[in-house]
Interface confidence: low
Amino acid sequence: EAHKSEIAHRYNDLGEQHFKGLVLIAFSQYLQKCSYDEHAKLVQEVTDFAKTCVADESAANCDKSLHTLFGDKLCAIPNLRENYGELADCCTKQEPERNECFLQHKDDNPSLPPFERPEAEAMCTSFKENPTTFMGHYLHEVARRHPYFYAPELLYYAEQYNEILTQCCAEADKESCLTPKLDGVKEKALVSSVRQRMKCSSMQKFGERAFKAWAVARLSQTFPNADFAEITKLATDLTKVNKECCHGDLLECADDRAELAKYMCENQATISSKLQTCCDKPLLKKAHCLSEVEHDTMPADLPAIAADFVEDQEVCKNYAEAKDVFLGTFLYEYSRRHPDYSVSLLLRLAKKYEATLEKCCAEANPPACYGTVLAEFQPLVEEPKNLVKTNCDLYEKLGEYGFQNAILVRYTQKAPQVSTPTLVEAARNLGRVGTKCCTLPEDQRLPCVEDYLSAILNRVCLLHEKTPVSEHVTKCCSGSLVERRPCFSALTVDETYVPKEFKAETFTFHSDICTLPEKEKQIKKQTALAELVKHKPKATAEQLKTVMDDFAQFLDTCCKAADKDTCFSTEGPNLVTRCKDALA
């Protein structure tokens, strides 16, 4: 239904706190270099204006669209061209082109320093002094580094942050209370960020239909007792919510997400028996809980999938009459029977089924042609199952750090032209799949592994798009989203690559490495490992292990030495010589 004033409508629906948080996120995601104070000033101005519209919807400018209002605010920022270069050209355009232009200038890898967490005492002091400003800083810092972060979910993480600080700042040992809890929130938020970026990529590159297919598969797995009409309705609503968030329409997105949560809780009987616990929670927690609710118990009496989709004499007629609906019912029926498959796999199977019908329904005897389609699914199912088994076995043998290193070697060989920091980031993220998924029960491993890997590889593709350097990566990234992971897995050593010259300075270390936190030490060692592979792409696992063990021993010895600097300067060159010999 149309409202005289969109901004008043959203302010009323969301309430002041969420309204302000979402506007702050929106501005931080569009203009990623601005300071918190600059954005906070704009947010206050927008909020004051919204209040005047709530009081009188006919007041001047209250009838303008949110894009117009927000865009005008952003374009009024002083020194826009100096700070943002060609993004300032967006301001010469009219809506909706102006907003599209802002979206195109979002930077997935902004040159911002890592978000450093202050030490516990300082955090608690500033949190107690002004909790609102403290949380505002959190929203701003996360949003500018993750310009596609799912906004209502970021409000949820801010709420978690708030609760942790409220609890831990009252404790005697603030540090040991805060660290593990905040680390947990950070880890979950980072995973949420790459997952949402994947959804936006799907929407941007392949449109709403592709996203809706993803949603149908995912929802059918989670709610196998809901009928197809219900799943279609939920998928349509979820697609709208995500389209809005990916498109920068954060107020509409959060509002519609709240509506969807309300609908689900009011219609539990036709959706799932597992929703009640979620529905008892307040809004942000409720929506978050619903998004990761456990799968409902599958109906016991589901007929074989073949009945309607292979054996039925009307398959081609049904397909021809309403292709999307027929394929949608196939995806729904297959997905609700397979919570143990990844969404990516289910979409590959649906694609295979569609291709089979396209081919067979044009032939003289269609049933004879498509009769074997389910058997043809077998290799598609076996491939990711083998991937999971092989990788989880390796993870169990090596542990997370060793597993990351194995992946780093593998991916550096596949795409040695990619920058070392990108390779290290990707390998560390891909390697976390072991900790995240390999400890789960057997039937949950495949969906966890493959859908997580797909999201991480999407980030690899986005970073590579900025500066394309590898034919291999370009090939895998230019295909459909669901084919990316199998494409990357199938890549072998890039034979076209000319090995890098050996530079001693790349492998020269100083005593400052000794005082680095463990994570930073690992990154330094992994950087060296990637550089070794770039120098010797065909080095064997044994050769690389020898070198890395020697390197670890060297660090351990010198970091324990009384005179660290001397140890590094004398033993360092010896290490470099040994490395060269080992790899010769």
Epitope: F228, A229, E230, K233, T236, N267, A322, V325, G328
Partner: nanobody, 123 residues
Framework: EVQLLESGGGLVQPGGSLRLSCAAS????????IGWFRQAPGKEREGVSC????????NYADSVKGRFTISRDNSKNTVYLQMNSLRAEDTAVYYC????????????????WGQGTQVTVSS
């Protein structure tokens, strides 16, 4: 473009009859359940009747049971609402809406909506 178009509304005396039609263009109705809704001035939109995609399952609001009949002709891509023994309280704008395969219990559950046709029952 996907469209639903209602027709057949008009002014009728109490006790009279009307037959509303809902024609689809841009998609085939075979896979869709069609619901009829009505909205009287100042009131919420309410469900009147619905027919599932197969045509086998139909339902009616208590206030119209025994007086209204819903049917479909998939070859014409059209759904009908036959309204007999009309009463003054049946006066409203009548809308048809489509949802995939099965009837829905809530207004929000329908994917496509028509623009509506006015039915006025008055002497």
């Amino acid at each position: 473009e996907v469209q639903l178009l209602e027709s057949g509304g008009g002014l009728v005396q109490p006790g009279g009859s009307l037959r509303l039609s809902c024609a689809a263009s841009g998609f085939t109705l075979d896979y869709y359940a069609i619901g009829w809704f009505r909205q009287a001035p100042g009131k919420e939109r309410e469900g009147v009747s619905c027919i599932a995609s197969s045509g086998g399952s139909t339902n009616y609001a208590d206030s119209v049971k025994g007086r209204f009949t819903i049917s479909r002709d998939n070859s014409k891509n059209t759904v009908y609402l036959q309204m007999n023994s009309l009463r003054a309280e049946d006066t409203a704008v009548y809308y048809c809406a489509a949802a995939v395969l099965e009837c829905r219990t809530v207004v929000r559950g329908y994917d496509y909506w028509g623009q509506g046709t006015q039915v006025t029952v008055s002497s």
